[in-house]
């Protein structure tokens, strides 16, 4: 087992909130059995850890929010993997169980004497994790112990089912909405024949299912649908790309309800197989505007249209984060590892020096270099504030006129906290209203992004539209520059005058061959030719029949 996973970030407090962030990438296929995590992550990992620590500092220094109560935290690494996250969640639960036993005076030493040892405070709620599949597994465990969970990026539709996931809430909308947005984009550009790819796991599977259902209702055909694991090997991605290629040149558009690393796997396979420019990827919010998806594979990603949950950058987070340094940041146990990975150098002489790097980190290095804030930062912070406001409301109702934790609130009852959380309504970090519907979901608005070549060897994401409450707005000129550039993704072109569609057995309804009607036939509907009755003949536009005018022959008429 990987020791890095057992590292925990602590911040003391009267009430402890748990958090699961993907501080490291998920284990590769060959390392899954050992649960050995991958490389350290900045946006999804370190930034979120720092957001938790700093947001709690801000909450604790706000005299109007939880006065006389200090919020602390215990942050663990989910590695974007169910087995790892479950293992870490069990640690949260264990803390709670030990604490509740201690409350009941059950803590005893091996020799039978009573213990003066104070165990850790129980976790009252959990923030995260990021992945839907992982969040489901974690929720299955947490709800057994009445521990509310607030997610900041788990968007699977399944999680709306309160009969299954009672203690789950989220500050993001359900994926049903972005599936609709993706279908609306496909419709807008008359792409009637597209390939589909999704990441194996709940996020991809339920999202793609919704996309396919909505597509069918709109007359959009799926050439073929494929699924792949995010951590699949090169061979699997190459095989998938070859299958997608088999649908060219007809299915040029590939709708990808995918996690970011799945998209990256596709881009890398495109590079290996020399397929840059062959496809247009339409990506879900797992891709959004992430540079860690496209870095090094920009040529392959060009033209990609992606869905991004609307969440503006949080300025005060950058003001805090960009000043962090490895020699002074001791409360984040992953920070030195991250610093070395980020700058590809070793923190020579530090206890966590990574000898795989030869170069010593210069003291002039700064996080300002190539800084990109996590695109879901606002949601992470809103999730933390939601927990704080929920606790605040609970304290107000259980301890009226009392500052601090009163006896009625000790130990914190998860059922009452859930009730209080569901009623939470406050102004979020970006000025938006944060509230939860009966399913614990939040309303959402999406931005439509386009990955473009902005100049020679300079690529970036451009905001080209929005999807809000069922309404799609797109700046077509920004995406295509001129109408003739709009990519076509159709199986068959419309039939010419006098032709009907013949759909071959086993083919989807968007694929046909055009067959002309016989000389005496007209086009009855797009699939049928009908013969004109005796005495009538097809009209010029071949859409009906006209009576043949009767011509009487006279003796003097020339031979026809």
């Amino acid at each position: 087992q990987s020791s890095e996973r057992r590292v925990v970030a602590h911040m003391p407090g009267d009430i402890i909130i748990g958090a699961l962030f993907s501080v490291h990438h998920q284990p590769t296929v060959d390392k899954v059995h050992e649960r050995k995590c991958g490389a350290v992550r900045e946006q999804y990992g370190i930034q979120r850890v720092e957001a938790m620590l700093h947001t709690l500092e801000r909450i604790n220094s706000d005299p109007t929010l939880l006065p006389n109560i200090t919020l602390g935290c215990e942050i663990r690494d989910s590695c974007w993997h169910s087995a790892v996250a479950l293992e870490q969640s069990i640690e949260f639960i264990r803390d709670s169980l030990i604490s509740s036993e201690e409350e009941e005076g059950l803590v005893r030493c091996v020799d039978g004497s009573s213990s003066s040892f104070r165990s850790k405070k129980p976790i009252v709620g959990v923030i995260g994790p990021g992945s839907s599949s992982v969040a489901i597994q974690v929720q299955n465990l947490l709800q057994l112990f009445n521990i509310p969970q607030i997610a900041y990026s788990a968007t699977s539709m399944d999680l709306s089912d309160k009969t299954l996931f009672k203690y789950f809430m989220r500050v993001v909308p359900s994926d049903a909405q972005q599936a609709r947005a993706m279908v609306d984009i496909v419709k807008r550009y008359n792409w009637t024949y597209v390939s589909a790819v999704h990441t194996e796991g709940n996020y991809g599977e339920s999202g793609m299912e919704a996309f396919k259902d909505m597509s069918a209702k709109e007359g959009i055909c799926i050439a073929h649908s494929y699924k792949i694991y995010s951590n699949a090997g090169e061979q699997s991605f190459d095989k998938l790309l070859k299958k997608l290629t088999s649908h060219l040149p007809k299915a040029r558009v590939v709708a990808c309800f995918c996690e970011g690393m799945t998209v990256r796997g596709l881009l890398m396979a495109m590079r290996r197989l020399g397929l840059a420019g062959e496809f247009l990827l339409l990506g879900s919010d797992g891709w959004a505007d992430r540079y860690d998806v496209t870095d090094g594979y920009q040529r392959e990603a060009v033209g990609g249209i992606t869905i991004k949950l609307q969440s503006p950058d949080v300025k005060w987070f950058d003001d805090y984060y960009l000043k962090l340094r490895p020699e002074t940041n001791h409360r984040n146990p992953w920070f030195q590892e991250f610093w070395q990975h980020r700058f590809q150098c070793r923190l020579e002489g530090f206890p966590q020096e990574n000898s795989k790097y030869n170069k010593t980190c210069n003291s002039s290095l700064t996080l300002k270099t190539h800084h990109v804030q996590d695109s879901k930062m606002g949601f992470v912070i809103n999730a933390i504030y939601s927990m704080a406001y929920g606790l605040h409301n609970m304290q107000m109702s259980l301890c009226p006129g009392y500052a601090g934790l009163c006896d009625a609130m000790k130990p914190i009852d998860g059922r009452k906290l859930l009730e209080s959380l569901m009623k939470t309504n406050f102004t979020g970090v970006s000025g938006d209203t944060i509230l939860f519907d009966e399913n614990g979901d939040s309303p959402g608005r999406y931005e439509i992004m386009n990955f473009k070549e902005m100049g020679k060897d300079y690529f970036d994401y451009i905001n080209v539209g929005s999807w809000d409450n069922g309404e799609l707005k797109m700046d077509d000129d920004e995406v295509w520059s001129k109408k003739s550039n709009i990519i076509r993704s159709v199986c068959s072109e419309p039939c010419e005058k006098g032709q009907i569609k013949v759909i071959r057995k086993g083919e989807v309804s968007c694929c046909w061959t055009c067959t002309p009607c016989k000389e005496n036939e007209y086009v009855f509907d797009e699939y049928t030719c009908k013969a004109c009755q005796l005495g009538s003949w097809p009209t010029d536009d071949l859409t009906g029949c006209d009576l043949i005018p009767v011509q009487y022959l006279r003796w003097g008429d020339p031979e026809p």
Epitope: E348, F350, S363
Partner: antibody, heavy 118, light 109 residues
């Protein structure tokens, strides 16, 4: 081995460039080449290091601005010194390490004497 | 900047005896300390790195210990050839900088 050259007598406010030549090994990405000076009867004083891999430089705070370390070829490193004063009179050593300092310097040149005097 | 304070400035001991030299750092430098031996007209010679690791070819009579701010070099079974000046060099990772101690002269009788 490493050997320094370029020392000698220089007037105050003058400039001088010292050269360190490595032989028997390449200045590969494994090594750091550093300059250390020692005034007569005093202890050594660290000046600067350069990482041979990509030329990243590391300086003592007092040396920044007046001293410049550079890798000029796969076997040579130089130290440019400007605005020299009598306090800069010392034997200047070139030393090799596998870091800026935490592993010590395991190969030293014999040194070259720099005298700053009018 | 980091300051390395070495004590004593001079020590005298008989052949076969033991000498202990101390070095104190003004900041926590973890285990980032090296010990050197220098004889007149020669460059320093590395004896110990990372506080306690013996450089190859150096006799095991030389022993380094300590971490944080307090470090010690112990030379046991003194030989005439050990007569030299010994310097500690501290590396301060937070500032990526080095400093040498003032030196300890060892006289062997």
């Amino acid at each position: 081995s490493v050997e320094e050259s370029g020392g000698g007598l220089v007037k105050p406010e003058g400039s001088l460039t010292l050269t360190c030549k490595a032989s028997g090994f390449d200045l590969s990405s494994y090594y750091y080449m550093c300059w250390v000076r020692q005034a007569p009867g005093k202890g050594p004083e660290w000046i600067a290091c350069i990482y041979a891999g990509d030329g990243t430089t590391y300086y003592a705070s007092w040396a920044k601005g007046r001293f410049t370390i550079s890798k000029t070829s796969s076997t040579t490193v130089t130290l440019q010194m400007t605005s020299l004063t009598a306090a800069d009179t010392a034997t200047y050593f070139c030393a090799r390490g596998t870091g800026v300092g935490s592993y010590g310097y395991n190969l030293w040149g014999p040194g070259t004497l720099v005298t700053v005097s009018s | 900047d980091i300051v390395m304070t070495q004590t004593p400035a001079s020590v005298e001991a008989a052949v076969g005896g033991t000498v202990t030299i101390k070095c104190q750092a003004s900041e926590n430098i973890y285990s980032n300390l090296a010990w050197y031996q220098q004889k007149p007209g020669q460059p320093p010679k590395l004896l110990i790195y990372r506080a306690s690791n013996l450089e190859s070819g150096v006799p095991s009579r030389f022993k380094g210990s300590g971490s944080g701010t307090e470090f010690t070099l112990t030379i046991s079974d003194l030989e005439c050839d050990d007569a030299a000046t010994y310097y500690c060099q501290g590396y301060y990772p937070s500032a990526v900088t080095n400093a040498f101690g003032g030196g300890t002269e060892v006289v062997v009788k």
